[in-house]
């Protein structure tokens, strides 16, 4: 039983545990609130549309609404799409929301609103008004908001949404909001901390404003505050990719010694980009509970060597001191204060962008006894010399990040690890802005129109690698040669990332010998030369190997490539060798008794499987446990007969996407007795099999999107009872007959995708129209994108809303 019309152009989800009915109308080109929204809807999302006005009638029947997301219906000009500039701000008529007695959250960001809406229901706890044109806050505006707990007012006056006047906040304006817990005034050209903030405040965001001084009593009564963000006031502007005005003479944000005295409950303090040169311990004398401190993008290179303030932070878990380098200075080494040793709770330490030449063991001695330390991030430092053996002191670390440095190997075979005969002249380094973009974004916590949650992603390390255990990230360095002595004493490593180096040697199975516990090796973006089939064999516990984007030697003719190196890796589960342009192989077969997943995208199987050359048809046959094989993007305009006979016996998932396939030997699928998923998307197929069930009895998921299919065969899905997912979207299908889509098969489908086809809505389509109206099968985008191309009157119309009343149909046939 359907309790909302199929014509509703929105996704409807039910969250039973929370008794929520969620209607998502994101980006549906709506110019009004659609008809047919279920009356029991609790969460309604209308973001990214073109609804011009809201009135009390808009939500009249929707008495159970708890959350309305009406963002981005008239985005400020500089923030919005140039193709769709909105010149008429969203009109909200008085009383539009007042009848919604269950409404708890209202998001009205990105609508060019001039003022805070009035007549809001007393039930409202969250009001978000970011990216509007509200730049005068008065007591009068806020008197109705006494029950609000979360108020977002950011991005109403900054370079991408200029207001051309100074942002004004009436004295004590927020005091009336006695229940306020979270207040954001970020990105607003605010000149001072608002006076007398509500005492129950838990989170205060004042970042990216033009506050020059924090006065002694600014936070005086905020005894419960847990998060304070003052970043971007008096910013460090060097190399930032946005308009940036520092304070006069690059002076720091002035913070009174006693400004933080009352913040006894503070857990998070962000002072990113405040041009600080020193951090007085006295700021932290009452901050025993501080867990996260961001001091990145300041001028604290010298302070890092003294850092007495660290003594006062016994509960600190995360510390970020990144990008504090002195301009035009390339330090010989890193000077860490002994005070770091007092951070007994520290789990994450980031010091990117300190910029120094040599990492020495004693540089890290203050960290040796930090038993809780899990992440040490020294990326983007232009380190040239580092003896990796020093990390034997850090076995408990989960991540050692040395990515984006200039580490390269030593010239001899001594045990000094990685180093180079570096020039000793002072060089001026400018850290690459794009490497770790979250340090160089104007607002790393900004929300997009599409998502309500904050989108900052912090973990630079490959998550799938990180989950295996202790990780050393050496990606994007200058390593051109590896040898076993480099990894001496690193036997505890589970994951090693060497991606993006210059390694071009012929690995013979000795290079990684000390890494007895290694389970994941990322060797992508190098210049692997697979001369020896013994390559990587010393890694007895290796489960995942990524040798993608190592095309250099594969692109040259006459070079030996031993693709059968896999036979020596006894526990290898997953092998990625994408984008290698592999078009030749010295060994005819790859062999493995353990491998379950092989990614072989972006190679040249079209050459290896050239017609008349049968030598490589069994390339994958001896991968006896292989379940997933991705051979998309291999320029295979056809598949020679014999390919499927040469497939491994246990194959479950096969991807042949993006190959330019013009035809497909459907019958040959009979060779793949266990095949469950077949992806043939983004090809040039024009037909489907006569009867899918004759080709495969095991197939559950068939993906045929983005092909050139014009029609379905008469008995296409007859007896295909095992099929659960069928994607026919973005083809040229004009007609679907009842025989092609037998109901006893379709009713088993979890998902059927039919959008972006070329349906002809003539009388021949009556059964199809009737069926989509009545089926319980989930058909995404049914109301909006399953449309008619003709005839004339029906062009562009949704199939679901067709009224073919002139056609006669005997539905009993």
């Amino acid at each position: 039983f359907r309790w909302f019309p199929k014509t509703l152009p929105c996704e409807v989800k039910v969250n039973i545990p929370e008794a929520h009915v969620i209607v998502d109308c994101t980006d549906k080109h709506l110019t009004e609130i659609p008809e047919g929204i279920p009356t029991n809807t609790t969460n309604l999302t209308l973001t990214i549309n073109h609804i011009p006005s809201i009135s009390p009638d808009s939500f009249r029947r929707l008495n159970h609404l708890e959350e309305i997301d009406l963002r981005c219906n008239c985005v400020p000009v500089l923030l919005g799409s140039k193709a769709n500039v909105c010149t008429k701000r969203l009109q909200i008529r008085p009383g539009s929301f007042s009848g919604l007695s269950d409404l708890k959250a209202l998001y009205l960001d990105g609508n060019q609103l001039l003022e805070i809406p009035q007549d809001l229901p007393s039930s409202l706890h969250l009001l978000s008004l970011e990216a509007n044109n509200i730049f005068s806050i008065t007591k009068e505006n806020l008197t109705e908001l006494v029950n609000i707990e979360t108020l977002y007012l950011g991005q109403n006056c900054y370079y991408r949404n200029p207001c051309n006047v100074s942002y004004s906040i009436e004295k004590d304006a927020f005091l009336v909001m006695r229940n306020l817990k979270v207040l954001s005034l970020k990105d607003n050209n605010v000149t001072a901390v608002p006076t007398t903030l509500p005492p129950n405040l838990l989170e205060l965001y004042l970042y990216n404003n033009i506050i020059k001084k924090i006065q002694e009593n600014d936070f005086n009564n905020l005894n419960e505050l847990q998060v304070l963000d003052l970043s971007g006031n008096c910013p460090r502007c060097y190399n930032v990719p946005y308009p940036c005005t520092p304070c006069e003479n690059n002076s720091p944000l002035q913070i009174h010694d006693n400004a933080f005295n009352s913040l006894t409950e503070l857990k998070v303090l962000r002072l990113h980009s405040n041009s600080l040169q020193h951090v007085p311990p006295t700021w932290f004398k009452n901050m025993n509970k501080l867990q996260e401190l961001d001091l990145s993008q300041n001028f604290l290179a010298k302070e890092i060597g003294d850092a007495k303030f660290l003594h006062f932070l016994p509960s600190l878990i995360q510390l970020d001191l990144s990008f504090n380098f002195e301009l035009q200075v390339y330090r010989a080494s890193m000077n860490l204060s002994q005070a770091f040793s007092s951070l007994k709770s520290l789990k994450i330490l980031r010091i990117r962008g300190y910029v120094f030449k040599e990492l020495k063991s004693f540089n890290l001695s203050p960290l040796h006894n930090l038993q809780n330390l899990e992440v040490l991030d020294l990326g983007t430092n232009f380190i040239k010399i580092a003896n990796l053996s020093m990390f034997k002191q850090f076995k408990r670390l989960k991540v050692i990040d040395l990515s984006v440095n200039k580490i390269s190997p030593s010239g001899d075979s001594s045990e000094v690890g990685f180093c180079s005969n570096a020039r000793t002249s002072v060089e001026s380094y400018e850290p690459q802005v794009l490497e770790q973009l979250h340090y160089f974004r104007y607002d790393k916590y900004a929300r997009s129109c599409r998502f309500k949650n904050k989108e900052a992603s912090f973990m630079s390390v490959n998550e799938s690698c990180y989950k295996y255990g202790q990780t050393l990230d050496l990606s994007k360095n200058s390593i051109f040669f590896v040898k076993s002595s480099d990894f001496q004493h690193l036997s505890f490593l589970k994951c090693l990332n060497l991606s993006g180096n210059l390694i071009s040697q012929t690995l013979n199975g000795s290079e990684f010998q000390p890494l007895a516990e290694l389970r994941y090796l990322d060797f992508s973006n190098n210049r692997l030369d697979l001369l020896h089939s013994t390559a990587f064999e010393e890694l007895h516990k290796l489960e995942v190997l990524d040798i993608s984007s190592n095309s250099h030697y594969f692109q040259s003719e006459g070079i030996t490539h031993m693709l059968n190196f896999t036979k020596n890796l006894k526990v290898l589960q997953k092998l990625m060798m994408n984008d290698n342009d592999i078009s030749s192989s010295t060994s005819r077969t790859m062999e493995s008794e353990s491998l379950r997943t092989l990614e072989f995208r972006g190679n040249h199987l079209d050459v290896l499987w050239r017609e008349g050359d049968n030598r490589y048809l069994q390339l994958f046959k001896n991968l006896l446990k292989l379940e997933e094989l991705d051979i998309s993007k291999n320029s295979l305009s056809f598949l020679p007969s014999g390919v499927f006979d040469g497939m491994p016996p246990n194959l479950k998932n096969l991807s042949l996407a993006k190959n330019g396939l013009k035809s497909f030997s459907w019958k040959k699928l009979q060779c793949l007795k266990n095949l469950e998923t077949l992806d043939l998307s983004h090809n040039q197929l024009t037909t489907v099999p006569e009867r899918l069930s004759n080709c495969s009895r095991s197939l559950k998921n068939l993906i045929l999107k983005n092909n050139q299919i014009r029609s379905l065969t008469k008995y296409f899905l007859q007896d295909a009872f095992q099929l659960r997912y069928l994607d026919l979207s973005s083809n040229k299908i004009q007609m679907i007959q009842k025989t092609s889509f037998p109901e006893n098969v379709l009713n088993n489908l979890k998902m059927l995708l039919l959008h972006h086809n070329r349906f002809l809505c003539t009388c021949d389509a009556v059964w199809f129209v009737w069926w989509v109206n009545h089926t319980e099968v989930t058909i995404p985008y049914l109301a909006t994108d399953v449309t008619c191309v003709g005839p004339g009157a029906h062009k562009g119309q949704s199939v679901i809303s067709l009224d073919l009343y002139t056609c006669e149909l005997d539905l009993t046939n």
Epitope: H278, P280, N286, K308
Partner: antibody, heavy 125, light 107 residues
Framework: EVKLVESGGGLVQPGGSLRLSCTTS????????MEWVRQPPGKRLEWIAA??????????EYSASVKGRFIVSRDTSQNILYLQMNALRAEDTAIYYC????????????????WGAGTTVTVSS | DIVMTQSHKFMSTSVGDRVSITCKAS??????VAWYQQKPGQSPKLLIY???TRHTGVPDRFTGSGSGTDYTLTISSVQAEDLALYYC?????????FGGGTKLEIK
């Protein structure tokens, strides 16, 4: 050479008032926190008042024992620190030292690197 | 307020001896401890701050150590001119507070 010289001590009756001065030289007076520390006869040193530096708006701070009775101030044109003592009690009898906070780039450290020779205050009837 | 306790009011030593003066805080003061020397008839003089950092011009026979609540001032080889009162002081929180002092006497 950095110098601090206290003056203004003497004998005063309980309930009476006294103003101590601390004349400074050899450093930029406005840049430093200045403190008053006293030492009652045979007892430990006791910090009683601070005058913060210019960066911290020359605001003041007091110990609980003198709050409301003593007022610290400074004359930045003459580089003099004052301690106005009112409602004096017998237990205020002590040597009063003027001291300079060691300073951490314009912030207080709450330890004291330069001390005056002290001036004696006796509160007795 | 944080209470600083110097358990020894007097300590007797000989020239050339090594002596250690101790100080205990009523709570963890995170190494924010200073030591002062006060000679008879003079004002206090800063020796050590942050538990172990020697102030400018202080002879290297004076060393400070400690963490948490327990702190020590050590004179590695006592000289006659070291006869004085020694005070510890916490600079962790306001009000800054001093110990009762330890008088070093030369035998």
């Amino acid at each position: 050479e950095v110098k601090l010289v206290e003056s203004g001590g003497g004998l005063v009756q309980p309930g009476g008032s006294l103003r101590l001065s601390c004349t400074t030289s050899g450093f930029t007076f406005s840049d430093f926190y200045m403190e008053w520390v006293r030492q009652p006869p045979g007892k430990r040193l006791e910090w009683i008042a601070a005058s913060r530096n210019k960066r911290n708006d020359h605001t003041t701070e007091y110990s609980a024992s003198v709050k409301g009775r003593f007022i610290v101030s400074r004359d930045t044109s003459q580089n003099i620190l004052y301690l106005q003592m009112n409602a004096l009690r017998a237990e205020d009898t002590a040597i009063y030292y003027c001291a300079r906070d060691a300073d951490y780039y314009g912030s207080s450290t709450w330890y004291f690197d330069v001390w005056g020779a002290g001036t004696t205050v006796t509160v007795s009837s | 307020d944080i209470v600083m306790t110097q358990s020894h009011k007097f300590m007797s030593t000989s020239v050339g001896d090594r002596v250690s003066i101790t100080c205990k805080a009523s709570q963890d003061v995170r190494t924010a401890v200073a030591w002062y020397q006060q000679k008879p008839g003079q004002s206090p003089k800063l020796l050590i701050y942050w538990a172990s950092t020697r102030h400018t011009g202080v002879p290297d026979r004076f060393t400070g150590s400690g963490s948490g609540t327990d702190y020590t001032l050590t004179i590695s080889s006592v000289q006659a001119e070291d006869l004085a009162l020694y005070y510890c002081q916490q600079h962790y929180n306001t009000p800054p507070t001093f110990g009762g002092g330890t008088k070093l006497e030369i035998k």
